[in-house]
Amino acid sequence: VEVKVPTEPLSTPLGKTAELTCTYSTSVGDSFALEWSFVQPGKPISESHPILYFTNGHLYPTGSKSKRVSLLQNPPTVGVATLKLTDVHPSDTGTYLCQVNNPPDFYTNGLGLINLTVLVPPSNPLCSQSGQTSVGGSTALRCSSSEGAPKPVYNWVRLGTFPTPSPGSMVQDEVSGQLILTNLSLTSSGTYRCVATNQMGSASCELTLSVTEPSQGRVA
C-alpha cells in the first residue's frame, strides 16, 4: 500500500483540533488494517506508541490520547485514513505514524510520517539579573519563558525617557533572552522590560536596575 501524507509539518494551536491527513490507494480487503501511532520528539520511530487501530471493521482508540482521537472517515476504507485529535496539548507535539496494511498489497511499506507542533503562547517570562551593578561595571539581564512553541524570541526595551546608550553598551540575544549592559553609568538605572513573542502571542516581565557608585552595594 502506498500512503500519502503532507510533506510539510503541521502546526495546531493549543486546545484546537489537529487533522493529520493520510490517504492511500489500495483495493481494500477483509484483512485491511490501519494503525496510528505516536513518537515523542527526539525519540526513534521504534519507540512509537499506538494511539488508534482499525481492524475487522472495528475502531480501537488506545493509550493516553484515546478519548481525543477519532477518524475523519469511519470506516477508513475509502482511501482516507485521516486522524482527528481534539483539544491538543503541548505533549501532543511529536511524530505521528499512519500505517496501512492490506495484504497482498505489499507494493511499499504503507507508512507515512507527520510531524505535529502544538503552538503554545509564551508563558510569563522570568526576569533576572547578575553581574556588577556599579558604575563602569557590566551586568546581564536574563529573560526566559518556561512555555512557548515555537520557542519565543526575546526583546528587551528600557522604559521611560533616557539618554541613548553608547553603541555596544547594550547587546541583546533574541534567542537566549539575554541583555548585556557594559560600562554602566548612573543613567543606565531604570526599568527594563523583556517581551517574549511567538506566532501565538506575547508575554512580558520587568526588572528595575539600580546602578550605584563603586563604593556602594547593589540593589535589584
Epitope: 490507494s25 480487503g29 475509502v78 482511501g79
Partner: antibody, heavy 118, light 107 residues
C-alpha cells in the same frame, strides 16, 4: 482464462427492483475485490459499487447509496447487485469487474442491460 | 468527488500515425490513474494503471505519462484494432470516477 458472466438485466418500471448476478471463473474469486460499473446510453462509465474479498467492506457513490446493495457468495464465485427504487437514470449496461491490487479494473464481464422505463 | 476531464472528445487519425489524448483531474492523483480501451459493442479493457504501467499483453505502442492532475495516453503507429473509445479513471480515494472518454476514429 478469466471469465465473468453477468445476468439478470431487464426492463423495469421506475420505482421497481431488480437483482443482477455475475458468475466468475478462471481466478480465485474469494481473494479478489469486485465492483459493478455501469455504462449509460451516452457512453459514460460510472462505478456503482465495490465489495472486499470476503464481503466485510462495501462502498457506493452517493448516486446509488441506500438504493443498491452489493453482495457476494464466495462458495459459488458469484457477485450480486440488488437494486431498488430504480430511476430512469439507472438505465445502463451493468458490468461486473475484478479489481487489481489497486482499485482499477483488470477484467470485465460482457455486461447486462437494465432499462428503467414506464 | 474528483472530476476527470478528457480531451479531445473525438479524434480522427490514420493507420500508422501517432496520437495523444489527455486526462485532467480536479485534484492531485499522484500517479493513481488507469486507462481503458473499449471497442464497439465490447466491454472496456485495461490498458494502463499507475499512470504508466502496462499490464501483460498490452502492446508497447501504448504509453501512459503524467502525474498530479495532468495525464496523457500516447499511441504510436496506430493499428486498425486501436480504433474505439478510451477512458481514464482515477484509482485513488472513493468514489472512483471516469473521464467522459475520447473516441478515436479512422480518418
Amino acid at each position: 482464462e478469466v471469465q465473468m458472466v453477468e445476468s439478470g438485466g431487464d426492463l423495469v418500471k421506475p420505482g421497481g427492483s431488480l437483482k443482477l448476478s455475475c458468475a466468475a471463473s478462471g481466478f480465485t474469486f474469494s481473494n479478489s475485490g469486485m465492483s459493478w460499473v455501469r455504462q449509460t446510453p451516452d457512453k459514460r462509465l460510472e462505478w456503482v459499487a465495490s465489495i472486499s474479498d470476503g464481503g466485510l467492506y462495501t462502498h457506493y457513490p452517493d448516486s446509488v447509496k441506500g438504493r443498491f446493495t452489493i453482495s457476494r457468495d464466495n462458495g459459488k464465485s458469484t457477485l450480486y447487485l440488488q437494486m431498488s427504487s430504480l430511476r430512469s437514470e439507472d438505465t445502463a449496461i451493468y458490468y461486473c469487474a475484478r479489481q487489481g491490487v489497486r482499485p482499477f479494473f483488470d477484467y470485465w464481464g460482457q455486461g447486462t442491460t437494465l432499462t428503467v422505463s414506464s | 468527488d474528483i472530476q476527470m476531464t478528457q480531451s479531445p472528445a473525438s479524434l480522427s487519425a490514420s493507420v500508422g500515425e501517432t496520437v495523444t489524448m489527455t486526462c485532467r483531474a480536479s485534484e492531485n492523483l499522484y500517479s493513481y490513474l488507469a486507462w481503458y480501451q473499449q471497442k464497439q459493442g465490447k466491454s472496456p479493457q485495461l490498458l494502463v494503471f499507475n499512470a504508466e504501467t502496462l499490464p501483460e499483453g498490452v502492446p508497447s505502442r501504448f504509453s501512459g505519462t503524467g502525474s498530479g492532475t495532468h495525464f496523457s495516453l500516447r499511441i504510436n503507429s496506430l493499428q486498425p484494432e486501436d480504433f474505439g473509445s478510451y477512458y481514464c479513471q482515477h484509482h485513488y480515494v472513493i468514489p472512483w470516477t471516469f473521464g467522459g472518454g475520447t473516441k478515436l476514429e479512422i480518418k
